[in-house]
């Protein structure tokens, strides 16, 4: 057959679905690779073809759309499983073509099993809630398009293994789960199971997400430099190692980039000739406030180095701060023999 623009295996779209549940998978061509949508392609006389390579096989084969109860079907640019089976796992390809044009992309589909508490190899999305911030909601994700608006599904929410009922501050409200006042104890995995009827059958959609309670923007402050500070003086003799830690506390801020850097005489360490190394470590509190420590190290400090200005800088979405380290050369202790000789006027 003639050439086909092959976008390869789109591993960015590692699709995971639960066994025995419906799955609707859109052909990624129209979402990520082509500049037109399915309707435009269809009206232009292009045909969408699906095929797959099952797990641990090399052979591409057509998808069987003649299974009992139309278990696998295609609707426009969507491949439907009603429901999935474990051995549906494999690489799926959608190809758009006519006599003069061809474009295709493959993507991996993994059908996974869950245990009795909804644990599975599924990668879970993380939803962050602000601590003690008032009412916040999470919504059962990725259930659009599975049933028409005329169908009223039932939704059951779980925290870990347990149905959410009679919780003090967590209330199920259909597709939403409301947290009246989020606390650290609300951290965990939350699962919604949506049950709906279709053509005389009952289907279930299980969606699990991780809730992480984080620092509230109400409590956020600009970066705080704990070290260097005015109480510690770095007094060194030439030839000794100089170690200066810069320790900065950052309040949690959604999507904020936290930065810490040193300047020496107003320049970045990379831009000067001294042999400086900087090591960084990061730790987080339970609410994802961040403490960054950058240790500036000069193995064998010179008297010139001890006259320089060492400034620690920090920046977040809340502001920028800087603090200079107090560095000085240690005055050598008087040597007794020399002082005595000088005292007697020796030459």
């Amino acid at each position: 057959s003639e050439r086909c623009d092959d976008w390869g295996l789109d591993t960015m779209r590692q699709i995971q679905v639960f066994e025995d549940e419906p799955a609707r998978i859109k052909c990624p061509l129209f979402e990520h690779f082509l500049k037109f949508n399915y309707s435009t392609a269809h009206s232009a006389g292009l045909t969408l073809i699906w095929y797959w390579t099952r797990q641990d096989r090399d052979l591409e084969e057509p998808i069987n759309f003649r299974l009992p109860e139309n278990r696998i079907s295609k609707e426009k640019d969507v491949l439907w499983f009603r429901p999935t089976l474990l051995n549906d796992t494999g690489n799926y390809t959608c190809m758009l073509r006519n006599t003069t044009y061809c474009s295709k992309v493959a993507f991996p589909l993994e059908v996974v099993q869950k245990d009795s508490c909804f644990n599975s190899p599924m990668k879970l999305p993380v939803h962050k809630l602000y601590i003690e911030y008032g009412i916040q909601r999470i919504t059962c994700p990725n259930v659009d398009g599975y049933f028409p608006s005329s169908v009223k599904p039932t939704i059951t929410w779980y925290m870990g293994c347990y149905k959410i009922q009679n919780f003090n501050n967590v209330i199920p409200e259909g597709m939403n789960l409301s947290f009246l006042i989020a606390l650290i104890s609300n951290n965990g995995n939350y699962t919604c199971v949506v049950t709906y009827p279709e053509n005389g059958r009952t289907f279930h959609l299980t969606r699990t997400l991780t809730v992480k309670v984080v620092g509230s923007p109400k409590n956020a402050v600009p970066p705080v430099i704990h070290s260097p500070n005015d109480h510690v003086v770095y007094e060194k003799e030439p030839g000794e190692e100089l170690l200066i830690p810069c320790t900065v506390y950052f309040s949690f801020l959604m999507d904020s980039r936290n930065e810490v850097w040193w300047t020496i005489d107003g320049k970045k360490p990379d831009d000067i000739t001294i042999d400086v190394t900087i090591n960084e470590s990061i730790s987080h509190s339970r609410t994802e406030d961040e403490t960054r420590t950058q240790i500036l190290s000069i193995k064998k400090v010179t008297s010139e180095d001890l006259k320089r200005s060492y400034v620690c800088h920090a920046r977040s979405a809340k502001g920028e701060v800087a603090k200079a380290a107090k560095v000085k050369q240690k005055v050598p202790a008087p040597r007794y023999t020399v002082e005595l000789a000088c005292g007697f006027g020796a030459t």
């Epitope: 025995d20 869950k114 009795s116 508490c117 039932t154 059951t156 149905k163 009922q165 199971v193 049950t195």
Partner: antibody
């Protein structure tokens, strides 16, 4: 379509054990709960316990704890309920019932167990 | 264990009648209530889950409602094939428990 086919009727002596099987088809056996419910002649329904074949997790009603054992064989998609130390009050129809969550969506046809000396 | 009390224990009604069966729990069950239908000599069948969710394939003349401790199953227009015993079942807290059943007959 979901089908649960149970083993045939049993007549047992008091003090003995009975093991009832329930063969499942038409759904992913590992991913649903299998419940066991019994019904004494002319009486209501009584939940005994359940098993999740995927990980073997079980829950039992206090009344049957220690006397009932639920197991599942994933390779044959078959669930088993064994009831020991039988007494005449255990004469009943025993049902298996599959539930993706907690409701029992589909039931087996039932197995009559008669305990008589 | 949560006790489930059903009433009436039996009723007789004419074809086309509206029939109501109630179920009361000994404590709040947060809508975690199912209704099952059992015809003579047959296994039970799920009619309604989570108080009001009609199970697939169940005729729309069956409906459920309620909250807290009190729940209702309604048959809007009784049909001859509805002759059966109806059971409520709570699944709020293990062990799951059933009501005593309501036998529905045709006059």
């Amino acid at each position: 379509q979901v089908q649960l086919v149970q083993s045939g009727a049993e007549v047992k002596k008091p003090g003995s054990s009975v093991k009832v099987s329930c063969k499942a088809s038409g759904y992913a056996f590992s991913s649903s709960w299998m419940n066991w419910v019994r019904q004494a002649p002319g009486q209501g329904l009584e939940w005994m316990g359940r098993i999740y074949p995927g990980d073997g997790n079980t829950h039992y009603a206090q009344k049957f704890q220690g006397r009932v054992t639920l197991t599942a064989d994933k390779s044959t998609s078959t669930a088993y309920m064994e009831l020991s130390s039988l007494r005449s009050e255990d004469t009943a129809v025993y049902y298996c019932g599959e539930g993706y969550l907690d409701p029992m969506d589909y039931w087996g046809q039932g197995t009559l167990v008669t305990v008589s000396s | 264990d949560i006790q489930m009390t059903q009433s009436p224990s039996s009723l007789s009604a004419s074809v086309g009648d509206r029939v109501t069966i109630t179920c009361s729990a000994s404590q709040g069950i947060n809508n975690y209530l199912n209704w099952y239908q059992q015809k003579p000599g047959k296994a039970p069948k799920l009619l309604i889950h989570y108080t009001s969710g009609l199970h697939a394939g169940v005729p729309s003349r069956f409906s459920g409602s309620g909250s807290g401790t009190d729940y209702t199953l309604t048959i809007s227009s009784l049909q001859p094939e509805d002759v059966a015993t109806y059971y409520c079942q709570q699944y709020s807290i293990l062990p799951w428990t059933f009501g005593g059943g309501t036998k529905v007959e045709i006059k």
